[in-house]
């Protein structure tokens, strides 16, 4: 006469995070009397998941009614699965005994693998702005995914980047994983409107990758070019001198006029014009009373852009 066998027909079960896992188990006999218990893992440190005899297991429901006479189906459902639930689950028959029930026979185990979506990629750039021709680093992070296999790509304005390094942690087995990637990007003067995109593809995303973006407008600083020009002499011996401040970004800019090294006027860029590439232009002018000067006048347009050291351009005004 054959003694009871515990049959777990599924070697492995794959479930998406948040869903319900069904772990199947049947016994071939009602003998001996005693409960079925489910455990995660084996050995002394195994974790009790369900006990037919006693206890409260709010996430677990039985597939069939275990109070039904002749029931030999001990399958269970575990609700709201998370990556932490991954592991091998054993259906174990116990024999009624005193003072404790005695383990009688175990099923072969079912490995529960949890598919968990990666979190939305977060892209972060350098702490300080950089100027064109400089190389800056961007990082992309995504967490909580399983299984470990994942693909990460970098793009700048739709063009795939190749200069990046990616790590998936931890290296060994884990319930879930994180990805960290650093890409190097060379800035150009036209990058104010550019975007850097980190794209993450994973089996849980059904071919619809997640994207994280960073705007290079947060990273780039385009220093201005200055041009000082003298307009024709106007009535009453007044000369109009203009300072053209071109192609700068961001807008934060302060301009100071100096006459022979002495501060004449300071103003902050306000009514700027925006270029197609996202940079700004601004113009300031100075009316100089020629009759007030006996000698030639050196006019200097000094610009402090975005907290950087001032740049200047001078113009010599002839007094004849």
């Amino acid at each position: 006469e054959e003694e009871l066998q515990v049959i777990q027909p599924d070697k492995s079960v794959l479930v998406a995070a948040g869903e319900t896992a069904t772990l199947r188990c049947t016994a071939t006999s009602l003998i001996p009397v005693g409960p079925i218990q489910w455990f995660r893992g084996a050995g002394p440190g195994r974790e009790l998941i369900y006990n037919q005899k006693e206890g409260h297991f709010p996430r677990v429901t039985t597939v069939s009614d275990l109070t039904k006479r002749n029931n030999m189906d001990f399958s269970i459902r575990i609700g709201n699965i998370t990556p932490a639930d991954a592991g091998t689950y054993y259906c174990v028959k116990f024999r009624k005994g005193s003072p404790d029930d005695v383990e009688f026979k175990s099923g072969a185990g079912t490995e529960l693998s949890v598919r968990a979506k990666p979190s939305a990629p977060v892209v972060s750039g350098p702490a300080a702005r950089a100027t064109p021709q400089h190389t800056v680093s961007f990082t992309c992070e995504s967490h909580g995914f399983s299984p470990r296999d994942i693909t990460l790509k970098w793009f700048k304005n739709g063009n795939e980047l190749s200069d990046f390094q990616t790590n998936v942690d931890p290296v060994g087995e884990s319930v879930s994983y994180s990805i960290h990637s650093t890409a190097k990007v060379v800035l150009t003067r036209e990058d104010v409107h550019s975007q850097v995109i980190c794209e993450v593809a994973h089996v849980t995303l059904q071919g619809d990758p997640l994207r994280g973006t960073a705007n290079l407008s947060e990273t780039i600083r385009v220093p201005p070019t200055l041009e000082v020009t003298q307009q024709p002499v106007r009535a009453e011996n007044q000369v109009n001198v203009t300072c053209q401040v071109r192609k700068f970004y961001p807008q934060r800019l302060q301009l100071t006029w100096l006459e022979n090294g002495n501060v004449s006027r300071t103003e902050t860029a306000s009514t700027v014009t925006e270029n197609k590439d996202g940079t700004y232009n601004w113009m300031s002018w100075l009316l100089v009373n020629v009759s007030a000067h006996r000698d030639d006048v050196k006019l200097t347009c000094q610009v402090e852009h975005d907290g950087q050291p001032a740049v200047s351009k001078s113009h010599d005004l002839k007094v004849s």
Epitope: E2, P32, K53, E54, K96
Partner: antibody
């Protein structure tokens, strides 16, 4: 689905008897068979349960004198060193208790121990 | 070993009455629910009514119900029918698989 007992009768004190319990309509392979007796005018008394070869157990008072066995279709209860107080109707029932209760019962067979 | 005590030993009742029988264990039964109720009529084998303390056996009328846990259990017949006059036994199981003991029985008689 039924259980039919046989083998009861008159036996002298110190004698032996083997009761049979034949199942029809179901196999005994995955079920325990329990034996219960009832002395005339008295209540029910659990004797023991026959599961598989390694799984048989008996009430403390029955150990030693009562031995059970079964095939897929018939269960047996071997009784030795019988005494007058063993006089009773002997029932077999399908089940092992707890979540496997005694749901099918035989009609009973009378064992009389007397000289 | 576990001991099972049924009370009362007999009860007289009329058809339509609500009847409550009690069974007390000397210690908690196995799993707090290893308690079954059987009905026996003269000259017949016992019949399973309730198992696991409160689960109604197949084919048993719903007027029978079981309750209780641990050491104290009851069998209730909500509206006694003529065919219910019989003796009722509880069977309790202790922690050891061989520790199955019947109570002394309660006879339900016609008043």
């Amino acid at each position: 689905r039924q259980l039919v007992e046989s083998g009861g009768g008159l036996v002298q004190p110190g004698g032996s008897l083997r009761l049979s319990c034949a199942a029809s309509g179901f196999s005994l392979s995955s079920h325990g068979i329990s034996w219960v007796r009832q002395a005339p005018g008295k209540g029910l008394e659990y004797i023991g349960t026959i599961g598989t070869g390694v799984i048989t157990y008996y009430a403390s008072w029955a150990k030693g004198r009562f031995t059970g066995s079964k095939t897929s279709s018939t269960a047996y209860l071997q009784m030795t060193s019988l005494r007058a107080e063993d006089t009773a109707v002997y029932y077999c029932a399908r089940g092992s208790a707890w979540n496997d209760p005694f749901d099918y019962w035989g009609q009973g067979t009378l064992v009389t121990v007397s000289s | 070993d576990i001991e099972m005590t049924q009370s009362p030993s007999s009860v007289s009742a009329s058809v339509g009455d609500r009847v409550t029988l009690t069974c007390q264990a000397s210690q908690s039964v196995y799993g707090n629910n290893d308690l079954a109720w059987y009905q026996q009529k003269p000259g017949q084998a016992p019949k399973l009514l309730i198992y696991l303390a409160s689960t109604l056996a197949t084919g048993v009328p719903s007027r029978f119900s079981g309750s209780g846990s641990g050491t104290d259990f009851t069998l209730t017949i909500s509206s006694l029918q003529p065919e219910d006059f019989a003796t009722y036994y509880c069977l309790g199981g202790g922690d050891d698989e061989a520790d199955n003991v019947f109570g002394g029985g309660t006879k339900v008689e016609i008043k």
